[in-house]
């Protein structure tokens, strides 16, 4: 996150860090617990990941320093990509994780509300991104959740800044015309959550951007209010 | 077919002008960052320049600074190299490849399409 | 500015050896490195990316590890079509840089 401040413990407890064992582990990307046994993230964190043997899911976690070899984690059974997904700037930058075994749900690891598809009107002023990603371009990932508040851009605003781009309803994005603050590197995936009415809603997810912070290029993220249907049909499948 | 074609090499003096363009077809130029990467005679791979999708952002390896220009034509699906003040280290076969980069996405793509390149020579 | 240091410059061996050929950043590059192919009169060719990920038509012959300053690129078992010059890119900032190298021939 660029021009972020540090979380604190439980803030965003929604939020999960996704690590890959191969060649060595690292943190993948970000994800956000939507049910006991699912995590709601990017389908271009899976570019070269050939089975879901190699994932593992850490909740509840603030600084990446406390996953140690023996720091309990949930393996990952599926990995369900929309199958319209091709690249991020495409669109259908959606995943599902299903988990091994289910989450006790804690102060520290729940869900967060998927929107509804009757909020669509909703203008949401208050939402922030968050992840443990670079804090410009150039850097490393860091060791404590970081949290930043964006506003929300209109799609047509959007599109003025992405010519070479079509901004599709199935994105929303957000980010200051002046730039400073915003998503990079590693926190894809993670979620836009936004608070309305005092409850939290998984508004968008971290997909793409040109640059991180810069001016006149906002972050482009998918909008989750667009795939609530499919969400459900493949969570609730038997 | 995803193909880099790159044109506009030939032989010139010392202290003289070439432009170089490479046309891209079979995907979507505008979402690739572009370089262009030389390798003088009997050597090894040298950056030379990066522009990012949009052409706002341009990079340059110190040998070329201030010399050379890169600049895309996303309309045209075209990257160029204007090359100024030209040595006889600059002697070279000059490629452009393309890389893909999610500034989101812990992920390094690689330049992953390259075109088969031009000769350009420096000599009196 | 990121050094990339590749060793050896050149190495001789035969069809059915196991080859490694590694690189050393100067600093952190993350998984920022690529590792490319290269015949003579051709274009360089990628072949692995993010430090690990073989790209698709690479023989598994073919693999990368390493992360942060060291990398290597290992070819397994050597086939007569393997004899090339081999480079590592650091892909983590700029400017860019190749390693300087690896010619393999037949022994």
């Known amino acids: 996150i660029v021009g972020g401040t540090a979380s604190v413990r439980g803030e965003w407890p929604w939020q999960v860090t996704l690590h890959t064992t191969s060649p060595t582990q690292r943190h993948l990307c970000g994800g956000s617990i939507i049910g006991n046994q699912w995590i709601l993230t990017a389908a271009h964190c899976f570019y070269g990941v050939e089975s879901p043997k190699i994932l593992r899911v850490y909740s509840g976690i603030l600084n990446q320093s406390e996953i140690k070899e023996d720091t309990s984690f949930f393996g990952v059974q599926e990995i369900i990509i929309h199958d319209q997904y091709k690249m991020a700037e495409s669109g259908y930058d959606i995943a599902l994780l299903k988990l091994e075994t289910t989450v006790n749900y804690t102060d520290s690891q729940r869900p967060i509300s998927l929107p509804s598809k009757g909020d669509r009107n909703v203008i949401y002023t208050d939402c922030w991104v968050t992840g443990w990603g670079y804090r410009k371009l150039r850097d490393k990932i860091q060791n404590t959740l970081q949290k930043a508040k964006i506003p929300l851009v209109t799609n047509e605003e959007c599109q003025k800044r992405y010519r070479g781009h079509k901004i599709t309803h199935k994105m929303i994005c957000a980010g200051y015309r002046e730039g400073g603050k915003d998503a990079c590197k590693g926190d894809s995936g993670g979620p836009l959550s936004c608070k309305h009415n005092e409850v939290w809603h998984l508004v968008g997810i971290t997909s793409w951007g040109e640059g991180c912070a810069q001016r006149e290029r906002p972050g482009v993220y998918t909008n989750v209010v667009e795939y609530v249907d499919w969400i459900l049909e493949k969570t609730q499948a038997v | 077919e995803v193909q880099l074609l790159e044109s506009g090499g030939g032989l010139v003096q010392p202290g003289g002008s070439l432009r170089l363009s490479c046309a891209a077809s079979g995907f979507t130029f505008s979402r690739y960052i572009m370089h262009w990467v030389r390798q003088a005679p009997g050597k090894g791979l040298e950056w030379v320049s990066s522009i990012s999708p949009s052409g706002g952002l341009t990079s340059y390896a110190d040998s070329v600074k201030g010399r050379f220009t890169i600049s895309r034509d996303n309309s045209k699906n075209t990257l160029y190299l204007q090359m100024n003040s030209l040595r006889a280290e600059d002697t070279a076969v000059y490629y452009c490849?393309?890389?893909?980069?999610?500034?989101?996405?812990?992920?390094?793509?690689?330049?992953?399409?390259w075109g088969q390149g031009t000769t350009v020579t420096v000599s009196s | 500015d990121i050094q990339m240091t590749q060793s050896p410059s050149s190495l001789s061996a035969s069809v059915g050896d196991r080859v490694t050929i590694t690189c050393r950043a100067s600093?952190?590059?993350?998984?920022?490195l690529g590792w490319y192919q290269q015949k003579p009169g051709k274009a360089p060719r990628l072949l692995i990316s993010?430090?690990?990920t073989l790209q698709s038509g690479v023989p598994l012959r073919f693999s990368g590890s390493g992360s942060g300053t060291e990398f290597t690129l290992t070819i397994s078992s050597l086939q007569p079509e393997d004899f090339a010059t081999y480079y590592c890119?650091?892909?983590?900032?700029?400017?860019?840089?190749f390693g300087q190298g690896t010619k393999l021939e037949i022994r």
């Open positions: 993010d430090a690990s």
């Open positions: 490849a393309r890389e893909f980069e999610n500034a989101y996405h812990y992920y390094y793509y690689g330049m992953d399409v």
């Open positions: 890119l650091q892909g983590y900032n700029y400017p860019r840089t």
């Open positions: 600093g952190d590059i993350g998984n920022a």
